[in-house]
């Protein structure tokens, strides 16, 4: 006869481990008892249980409630046991010793491998700002046994680097993703992907990139100068910019206060029916936490009753200031 067993038994942390030990013998052979032991290179041998054909299962008190026989039906030649709720400390070598009649004794060893699935965590890097050089976007850490694989899934161009720390019963892997921030990356997903034999599928954590920027400001509304005539209603100037965080807008007049009736509504400056009083230099101020920008335009309101007054061009200028 011979013992049927496994070289390696793999189980996920918290699951029950079946330690197999089946005696394959002649029909007239009997198994009298099966002894199970843990074999540790440092501690030596620790008896786990004795499975006796007459007296049943006897378990080392240190393993009480953790070692059981598999559920029925059970073959009398099957000396397998269940180790309930496997923990990392259970990992190691196990031995079954089978006493048979009349063939004598047999023994076999197997290794129990306890997989500890990782629980990954993603930590965003410092705030990203357009204009920075290579910057840490995020780091992702996962600890498990064996060491997990940590990679990144993203359309964003960047570099990834990994390092691992080995602990007595596990390994922690940290991967960092670096990039050169640009506004095109705003809102793009950066996904940490953790693979491990103890996971049925990869674990994924997604971080949405936010890159602080502020675009140049410009003013729209003066494209057709002929519209800016005395008496015209609904004339507006709109300040154009974009940024992250979204910018705030403010309007001022360079050569004095805003004329009566001129209303500021966010990025838009609304005029009442135009008069020559509305002529002047208007400044749009755009700002967010990163920077501020200005754009100024000269408005000349034409009086049809005064054809001698001509304006060839509306002038505009742009300025910006970084916080």
């Amino acid at each position: 006869g011979e013992l049927e067993t496994s070289d390696v038994v793999t189980v996920v942390l918290g699951q029950d481990a079946k330690l197999p030990c089946f005696y394959r013998g002649d029909p007239d052979e009997q198994v009298g008892q099966v002894a199970w032991a843990r074999v540790d290179p440092n501690e030596g041998i620790r008896e786990l249980a004795l499975l006796h054909s007459k007296y049943g299962l006897h378990v080392n008190p240190a393993y009480e409630d953790r070692v059981e026989q598999p559920p029925p039906p059970r073959d009398p030649l099957d000396g397998s046991v269940l180790l309930r709720n496997a923990v990392q400390a259970d990992e190691g070598e196990y031995e079954c010793r089978v006493s048979t009649f009349p063939a004598g004794s047999f023994q076999a060893r197997m290794r129990l491998r306890v997989l500890v699935p990782p629980l990954p965590s993603l930590n965003p890097g410092p705030p990203l700002e357009e204009g920075q050089g290579l910057t840490l976007a995020a780091s992702c850490t996962a600890e498990g046994s064996p060491a997990p694989s940590v990679t990144w899934d993203t359309e964003v161009k960047g570099t990834q680097s990994s390092r691992s720390f080995t602990h007595p019963r596990s390994a922690a892997v940290t991967s960092e993703f670096h990039l050169v921030p640009s506004r095109s990356m705003n809102g793009q997903p950066l996904t940490c992907v953790v693979s491990h034999p103890g996971l049925l599928q990869d674990r994924r954590i997604t971080h949405t990139l936010q890159v602080a920027f502020l675009a140049e400001a410009s003013v729209r509304g003066l494209e057709d100068q002929n519209l800016w005539q005395v008496g015209r209603e609904g004339a507006t100037l709109k300040c154009l910019s974009e940024g992250q965080p979204p910018p705030k807008y403010n309007w001022t007049r360079l050569d004095g206060p805003l004329p009566s009736g001129v209303r500021v509504k966010g990025d838009t400056l609304g005029f009442p029916p135009l008069t020559t009083e509305h002529s002047g230099v208007y400044v749009c101020h755009v700002s967010n936490e990163l920077s501020s920008r200005d754009s100024q335009v000269t408005v000349e309101v034409l009086d049809p009753e005064d054809p001698g007054k001509q304006v060839d061009l509306v002038s505009a200028s742009h300025h910006h200031h970084h916080h």
Epitope: Q33, I45, G56, P61, E64, R97, S105
Partner: antibody
Framework: EVQLVQSGAEVKKPGSSVKVSCKAS????????MHWVRQAPGQGLEWMGW????????NYAQKFQGRVTMTRDTSISTAYMELRSLRSDDTAVYYC??????????????WGQGTLVTVSS | DIVMTQSPSSLSASVGDRVTITCRAS??????LNWYQQKPGKAPKLLIY???SLQSGVPSRFSGSGSGTDFTLTISSLQPEDFATYYC?????????FGQGTKVEIK
């Protein structure tokens, strides 16, 4: 300090029964198996069986099956071995011995002082 | 049942001598072999378990070796308190069985 204290010597008639006690102290009684080993005068050691004090489960050597019963009373941390249908060749010193933590069913790390049972008509 | 055979049955030695006792199992018992010391009128005392592991509190002059079927207990330098009877015992399977003992006497 671990101690196993056994009951005193007994003289019994053939065919009668004897019950030997073993009181444990200095450790958690239910955390270790208790074995019984006997030694006839001038002879070697002979294993009789064990009891798991926690569950009450037993395992007896085939030689003693049907004649021996091992029990325990966890409230007083005491194990008992009763041997029935005594014969003159049962005259021996009977020891209780604690199974070790690592080798619960096969290594005896502490022993009682022994109880001499004499079977004589 | 596994039969354990010790040799010699008895030996005479002097204080300071190196003493070796052998134990043979009727079948392979791996390293499931233990040694006990017994003095007259006293209970046995565990010396060595798992063939070579020294029980806590036992002097280091005692050592055990062997695997499979052949095992040895060695006392490197015999002391006056070591004169006693020594038993081997297998814990490979039940019934647990002992050797017949080796009596170490003063020469």
């Amino acid at each position: 300090e671990v101690q196993l204290v056994q009951s005193g010597a007994e003289v019994k008639k053939p065919g009668s029964s004897v019950k030997v006690s073993c009181k444990a102290s200095g450790y958690t009684f239910t955390g270790y198996y208790m074995h019984w080993v006997r030694q006839a005068p001038g002879q070697g050691l002979e294993w009789m069986g064990w009891i798991n004090p926690n569950s009450g489960g037993t395992n007896y050597a085939q030689k003693f099956q049907g004649r021996v019963t091992m029990t325990r009373d966890t409230s007083i941390s005491t194990a008992y071995m009763e041997l029935r249908s005594l014969r003159s060749d049962d005259t021996a010193v009977y020891y209780c011995a604690r199974g070790s933590a690592l080798h619960f069913f096969g290594v005896f790390d502490y022993w009682g002082q022994g109880t001499l049972v004499t079977v004589s008509s | 049942d596994i039969v354990m055979t010790q040799s010699p049955s008895s030996l005479s030695a002097s204080v300071g001598d190196r003493v070796t006792i052998t134990c043979r199992a009727s079948q392979s018992i791996s390293s499931y072999l233990n040694w006990y010391q017994q003095k007259p009128g006293k209970a046995p005392k565990l010396l060595i378990y798992a063939a070579s592991s020294l029980q806590s509190g036992v002097p280091s002059r005692f050592s055990g070796s062997g695997s499979g079927t052949d095992f040895t207990l060695t006392i490197s330098s015999l002391q006056p308190e070591d004169f006693a009877t020594y038993y081997c015992q297998q814990s490979y399977s039940t019934p647990l069985t002992f050797g017949q003992g080796t009596k170490v006497e003063i020469k």
